[in-house]
């Protein structure tokens, strides 16, 4: 039913559905080391990992989405792994006037889900 | 820079990138034909294609997981097609009491982007 | 694990100079800032400004603009903060903060005393 | 520049008891606001970043919530440990300013 929960446990096995995963990124990763100061080490945490059926389905049309992959996996992608919220991120910047905060509300993940 | 617009023609030719497809769905697809009167049929938008490069990037996060996947694919997935907006549905309902109508809010996307 | 070791005590007359050191370990220094904090005796804590250790650009509060200085030695991973012309109301206890990406800092010296006094 | 005020200035709570402290911006700082305990003689400890992430190692007890100008450090239930000044912060912009602090005391 679209009212089942979602399935928080995982059936593939440990670290294989999707969660929250810490990568570390330079700025010049980024490709920002012109026009940001500091930190110039940033701990990205991203979503990885699969979306097994029903496994942290985000709403109704991720249910959905799961069922029909399973009746036209051709057709219907299965849901896959995105941020569900974000943790605010603050940088220093260079400006044409000095140095100035800038926060980022949607760059780091806070928690995942299957959409 | 992070500040780059999300790019929105896509390199990989037409309808291979992140875009709404309609997918036809009878109620017993769904398991909903219990307690779902009508409509038996459902026009279910739904995001599929890929995601290159800064292709519909849903935001700043999904730029820096473009060019990190980029930079270490087998750490870092690419940002996929999900939902950016969903159009409300009404479906009959069978209950006790007879019949009611339910808004489905988050069951037929409206639009995609890549997160 | 993160580190900020911070000079010892200073007895310094007005109109002297002062300088406060830093050392930090446990990372890489030219990836932060560092912040510097002071706390007047019985008082709250009062921003002093921030550098940055990979680029030596600072941002000082505007009370203390043309009086403080900070600097940093990359070769010893060593932050410096100089207040010049001390008054009596710059007595107080100085830190040095490592900055983070998400402004609140858990990243303390321990703190430097350092007293105005005739 | 943005002033933080707290309320408080002084708050007697008993140990087992809830206590709520109080942050009030004079402009929004969005969700950029921390908050410090100090005990004497020691550096501040970051208990909260982003007006309501608990830093690492930080109790349960300890939880903030607000954004834009009113946020709110609440301790469920007070231990011994806990009586210390409380400081909030925001890093919305430059100057970065602290408030004035809360003293949590023993009633």
């Known amino acids: 039913s679209a009212h089942a929960h979602p399935r928080d446990s995982c059936p593939l096995g440990p670290g294989r559905c999707c969660h929250l995963e810490t990568v570390q990124a330079t700025l010049e990763d980024l490709g920002w080391s012109d026009w940001v100061l500091s930190p110039r080490q940033l701990q990205l945490s991203m979503c990885v990992g699969e979306c097994p059926h029903l496994y942290r389905s985000a709403n109704t049309h991720a249910q959905i989405k799961a069922r029909l992959h399973g009746l036209q996996p051709d057709k219907v992608p299965a849901p896959c792994c995105v941020p569900s919220s974000y943790t605010p991120v603050v940088l220093m910047h260079r400006t044409d006037s000095g140095v100035s905060l800038q926060t980022y509300d949607d760059l780091v993940a806070r928690g995942c889900h299957c959409a | 820079s992070a500040h780059a617009h999300p790019r929105d023609s896509c390199p990989l030719g037409p309808g291979r990138c992140c875009h709404l497809e309609t997918v036809q769905a009878t109620l017993e697809d769904l398991g909903w034909s219990d307690w779902v009167l009508s409509p038996r049929q459902l026009q279910l938008s739904m995001c599929v294609g890929e995601c290159p490069h800064l292709y519909r990037s849903a935001n700043t996060h999904a730029q820096i997981k473009a060019r990190l996947h980029g930079l270490q694919p087998d750490k870092v997935p690419a940002p996929c097609c999900v939902p950016s907006s969903y159009t409300p549905v009404v479906l009959m309902h069978r209950t006790d009491s007879g019949v009611s109508l339910q808004t489905y809010d988050d069951l037929v996307a409206r639009g995609c982007h890549c997160a | 694990q993160v580190q900020l070791v911070q000079s010892g005590a200073e007895v310094k007359k007005p109109g002297a100079s002062v300088k406060v050191s830093c050392k930090a370990s446990?990372?890489?220094?030219?990836?932060?800032?560092i912040f510097w904090v002071r706390q007047a005796p019985g008082q709250g804590l009062e921003w002093m400004g921030w550098?940055?250790?990979?680029?030596?650009?600072?941002h000082y509060a505007q009370k203390l603009q043309g009086r403080v200085t900070m600097t940093t030695d990359t070769s010893t991973s060593t932050a410096y903060m100089e207040l010049r012309s001390l008054r009596s109301d710059d007595t107080a206890v100085y830190y040095c903060?490592?900055?983070?990406?998400?402004?609140?800092?858990?990243?303390w010296g321990q703190g430097t005393l350092v007293t105005v006094s005739s | 520049e943005i002033v933080m005020t707290q309320s408080p200035a002084t708050l007697s709570v008993s140990p087992g008891e809830r206590a709520t402290l109080s942050c009030r911006a004079s402009?929004?700082?969005?969700?950029?606001l921390a908050w410090y305990q100090q005990k004497p003689g020691q550096a501040p400890r970051l208990l909260i970043y982003?007006?309501?992430t608990r830093a690492t190692g930080i109790p349960a007890r300890f939880s903030g919530s607000g954004s834009g100008t009113e946020f709110t450090l609440t301790i469920s239930s007070l231990q011994s440990e806990d009586f210390a000044v409380y400081y909030c912060?925001?890093?919305?912009?430059?100057?970065?300013?602290f408030g004035g602090g809360t003293k949590v005391e023993i009633k």
């Open positions: 903060v490592r900055d983070t990406q998400y402004g609140g800092s858990p990243y």
């Open positions: 912060q925001q890093y919305n912009n430059w100057p970065i300013t």
């Open positions: 446990g990372y890489t220094f030219t990836d932060y800032g």
């Open positions: 982003g007006a309501s």
């Open positions: 402009q929004s700082v969005s969700s950029n």
């Open positions: 550098i940055t250790a990979y680029s030596g650009d600072t």
